[in-house]
Amino acid sequence: ADLGSMGYFELQLSALRNVNGELLSGACCDGDGRTTRAGGCGRDECDTYVRVCLKEYQAKVTPTGPCSYGYGATPVLGGNSFYLPPAGAAGDRARARSRTGGHQDPGLVVIPFQFAWPRSFTLIVEAWDWDNDTTPDEELLIERVSHAGMINPEDRWKSLHFSGHVAHLELQIRVRCDENYYSATCNKFCRPRNDFFGHYTCDQYGNKACMDGWMGKECKEAVCKQGCNLLHGGCTVPGECRCSYGWQGKFCDECVPYPGCVHGSCVEPWHCDCETNWGGLLCDKDLNYCGSHHPCVNGGTCINAEPDQYLCACPDGYLGKNCERAEHACASNPCANGGSCHEVPSGFECHCPSGWNGPTCALDIDEEFGLVPRGSGHHHHHH
């Protein structure tokens, strides 16, 4: 499997001038034995290609040793001297093509790296003469130049010019982070995503920028409906407000009272906190029976007792649960006009003589009710 890369070191060769068409050894590229000091090189020009070695920063550059940061090479670019299009948009397109395995600008070398870019580096650039019959060896070296320095990842190219023993080289370099890597060392990873691992895009610094409706370090926490009481509700999908057990309402801010709670409410779920004057487990017991029913009569004073219970304190002369009965009701001789008084559970009854009527035999039938015959039934007065 491809390891992928955190970034790329890019080198774009712009120009190479080898006016005499010679090798670093002084020999001619065509290999006919002559040197420039013996009358110049012949018809055959050098078949020039470039090799690039990238390694750790060295104050004193050693051309040998491993290219610890990577290496690359170009195809044959031209003869003794040539110019290539400057790096820029073409180079960017080529880089994109090279990463997908497509054709790239011949003068562009892309060296991927899979480590945090250290910023300091050593670059060794070698121009070689291509010979079909031989493998590269020191005899075919045209020029070797080196540069040790620092470079930060950015889109801008940095120009380098080298005047070697034999050839002059002009090139541009830059370091760029791969598309999902950020920071000065290209080791900060951020890939935009919208799935169960997170819902975010990446800002220019590689920080996760949560999509609308999401929050948290990985943008995996949904932002609930505005007003949702997050102590008693929440959401897994943005804009919702799902209540915890025991809570209800649009914003999960209403507790669920104890089932069957009548005259009560709750502050905590499954409670039944009674309204004033109500009691019992379900707040269904009236603690103020007196106030709501007024059961005592005849001036009796009502006293609340157990829930749903009361007592009547009766005034003198009255008794019964509600003070509805008069005590010794006939003692005051309530019956007039010769009526006879009889005590009954509800008070007294007057048995009126012929011609009189009413609760206390005070109504004259002849005067008041001419139509009512004398001696009609009993008339009672209840206290």
Epitope: A1, L3, D195, F196, F197
Partner: antibody, heavy 122, light 107 residues
Framework: EVQLVESGGGLVQPGGSLRLSCAAS????????IHWVRQAPGKGLEWVGG????????DYADSVKGRFTISADTSKNTAYLQMNSLRAEDTAVYYC???????????????WGQGTLVTVSS | DIQMTQSPSSLSASVGDRVTITCRAS??????VAWYQQKPGKAPKLLIY???FLYSGVPSRFSGSGSGTDFTLTISSLQPEDFATYYC?????????FGQGTKVEIK
């Protein structure tokens, strides 16, 4: 050719440990997520957990949180599932799968390994 | 966790039949639903991703639709190689969850 190959399954006693490996090839390991999915005998699929090898981010199902650990070695293109405090209910075929990155919401598992059987029994 | 409820849990059909399997999510999962086919002793294979996109190499008789909470996998004309178990999966909210599966058997 994309390939995922699991190994490390076997018989283990309750309370024991086992480490499964998932060797990846044929794709850029650090440009993918690797997930572990299990299937108990005769049952359906259950997502166990996953990792983003590029930054080491992991997530787990509640049923294995605190007992299982997923890791990845990018130099070896291999993901691991370290299983501790194993229970009888962890008995299953364990698959590793690669997630398919799409610009649409979600991430499907486009390549799966052949699976490795883990049996937890005394 | 989001529950993915598939229906039916099994069905019998003949070659050439049109088969529809539904999957209902307990909460909105956008279009983050995939469908897989699994044959006995084998690993699952991806058929549909993002609710309606046909995965590379999958025959066009398979199609998917839906968004939010209701999703459908349709096989327009059932072929002998399609007899298998089918699973839906949501990958929008962690943890990712699968449906219980639908077994498609030969009538």
């Amino acid at each position: 050719e994309v390939q995922l190959v699991e190994s490390g399954g076997g018989l283990v006693q309750p309370g024991g440990s086992l480490r499964l490996s998932c060797a990846a090839s044929g794709f850029t390991f650090t440009n993918s997520d690797i997930h572990w999915v299990r299937q108990a005998p005769g049952k359906g699929l259950e997502w166990v957990g996953g990792i983003t090898p590029a930054d080491g981010y992991t997530d787990y199902a509640d049923s294995v949180k605190g007992r299982f650990t997923i890791s990845a070695d990018t130099s070896k293109n291999t993901a691991y599932l370290q299983m501790n405090s194993l229970r009888a209910e962890d008995t299953a075929v364990y698959y590793c799968a690669r997630s398919y990155w799409s610009s649409s919401p979600g991430s499907a598992f486009d390549y799966w390994g052949q699976g490795t059987l883990v049996t937890v029994s005394s | 966790d989001i529950q993915m409820t598939q229906s039916p849990s099994s069905l019998s059909a003949s070659v050439g039949d049109r088969v529809t399997i539904t999957c209902r999510a307990s909460q909105d999962v956008s279009t983050a639903v995939a469908w897989y086919q699994q044959k006995p002793g084998k690993a699952p294979k991806l058929l549909i991703y993002s609710a309606s996109f046909l995965y590379s190499g999958v025959p066009s008789r398979f199609s998917g639709s839906g968004s939010g909470t209701d999703f459908t996998l349709t096989i327009s004309s059932l072929q002998p190689e399609d007899f298998a178990t089918y699973y839906c999966q949501q990958s929008y909210i962690s943890p990712s969850t699968f449906g219980q599966g639908t077994k498609v058997e030969i009538k």
